[in-house]
Interface confidence: low
Amino acid sequence: FERTRSLQDPCSNCPAGTFCDNNRNQICSPCPPNSFSSAGGQRTCDICRQCKGVFRTRKECSSTSNAECDCTPGFHCLGAGCSMCEQDCKQGQELTKKGCKDCCFGTFNDQKRGICRPWTNCSLDGKSVLVNGTKERDVVCGPSPADLSPGASSVTPPAPAREPGHSPQ
């Protein structure tokens, strides 16, 4: 066991927050300011991410973990680890290359991000439109026309609006 240990890479003893300094006989040196190492045995420390410009700091960098960024008001995160910030639009709009544009008739967007999506087609479920759709809201489907014939009970509550799809945005 001792023999195995002696053959080990001496750098493997350096904990997170340090690096194995080849210039100092492989001593474990603390990461310099504005750098970090999140795992042990590192030969260098990584430079901390800086949340600049449209990014703002969500979590400060420490010697063992990188900073985390989110976006300033009016923007939202895109990409893994908030690698990009994309401009917010208003509800009822979508972001195009030419900026925020209103949803076309027959589509809606109830969020400040993402794309306009088509209104639910109530007739596919044999239902009728109870509340018309807008640029900001999907239609609300109600009972089928047959259910509303004279004498028929109409106490059934309308179906909830369709849950917006969670496609990547």
Partner: antibody, heavy 119, light 106 residues
């Protein structure tokens, strides 16, 4: 000393492909917090940012003019950055510079490699 | 995308002149504005970063100022080696460049 040396440029027909390389020395391409990428300059024109890749390699960025046609990648073992150029057009004719971006400013530039798209 | 507009597009000046180049952004970019010098057949060289910080090794006759949407590069006393094209670049959101300002000998 930080150095970036591009290669791979040349004459190619419209619709053709090329792969540009950028050999880095004096720093590691995989250093966190350092992005590297490509900027081009058409003959007699200004500078246009083309593409970038984050230090951790997890994020790639492209200008709208090249999205879907160009692919940026790197080989950490060779400390080399690549730009694969597909479906080339006459308007892609330019000197392509490899750059290192230190949180915004492009602090280091290669000497450039000329890509000419012509039939 | 953020657009940068440089003015003038070219200017003629003499050695010893004070030269001012402006760069206007289409939206606020706080101070994330950088300046480069490019000579024919050469790669651009970083002069000023984050609006007003002089890059190491750049002569002190170069200075930068501004914030928000309006920025200025000033050469206090033009030297023969300063005749070149100058570009501004924003690093607030991705990276875009101004169209350049060519400084020529009068």
């Amino acid at each position: 000393e930080v150095q970036l040396v591009e290669s791979g440029g040349g004459l190619v027909q419209p619709g053709g492909s090329l792969r540009l390389s950028c050999a880095a020395s004096g720093f590691s391409l995989s250093t966190g917090g350092v992005a590297v990428g490509w900027i081009r300059q058409a003959p007699g024109k200004g500078l246009e940012w083309v593409s970038g890749i984050s230090g951790d390699g997890g994020t790639t960025y492209y200008a709208d003019s090249v999205k879907g046609r160009f692919t940026i990648s790197r080989d950490n073992s060779k400390n080399t950055l690549y730009l694969q150029l597909n479906s080339l057009r006459a308007e892609d004719t330019a000197v392509y510079y490899c750059t290192r971006e230190d949180y915004g400013p492009h602090a280091y530039w290669g000497q450039g490699t000329l890509v000419t798209v012509s039939s | 995308d953020i657009q940068l507009t440089q003015s003038p597009s070219s200017l003629s000046a003499s050695v010893g002149d004070r030269v001012t180049i402006t760069c206007r952004a289409s939206q606020s970019i706080t101070t994330y504005l950088n300046w480069y010098q490019q000579k024919p057949g050469k790669a651009p060289k970083l002069l000023i970063y984050d609006a007003s910080n002089l890059e190491t090794g750049v002569p002190s006759r170069f200075s930068g100022s501004g914030s928000g949407t309006d920025f200025t590069l000033t050469i206090s006393s033009l030297q023969p080696e300063d005749f070149a094209t100058y570009y501004c670049q924003q690093s607030y959101s991705y990276s875009t460049f101004g169209q350049g300002t060519k400084v020529e000998i009068k």
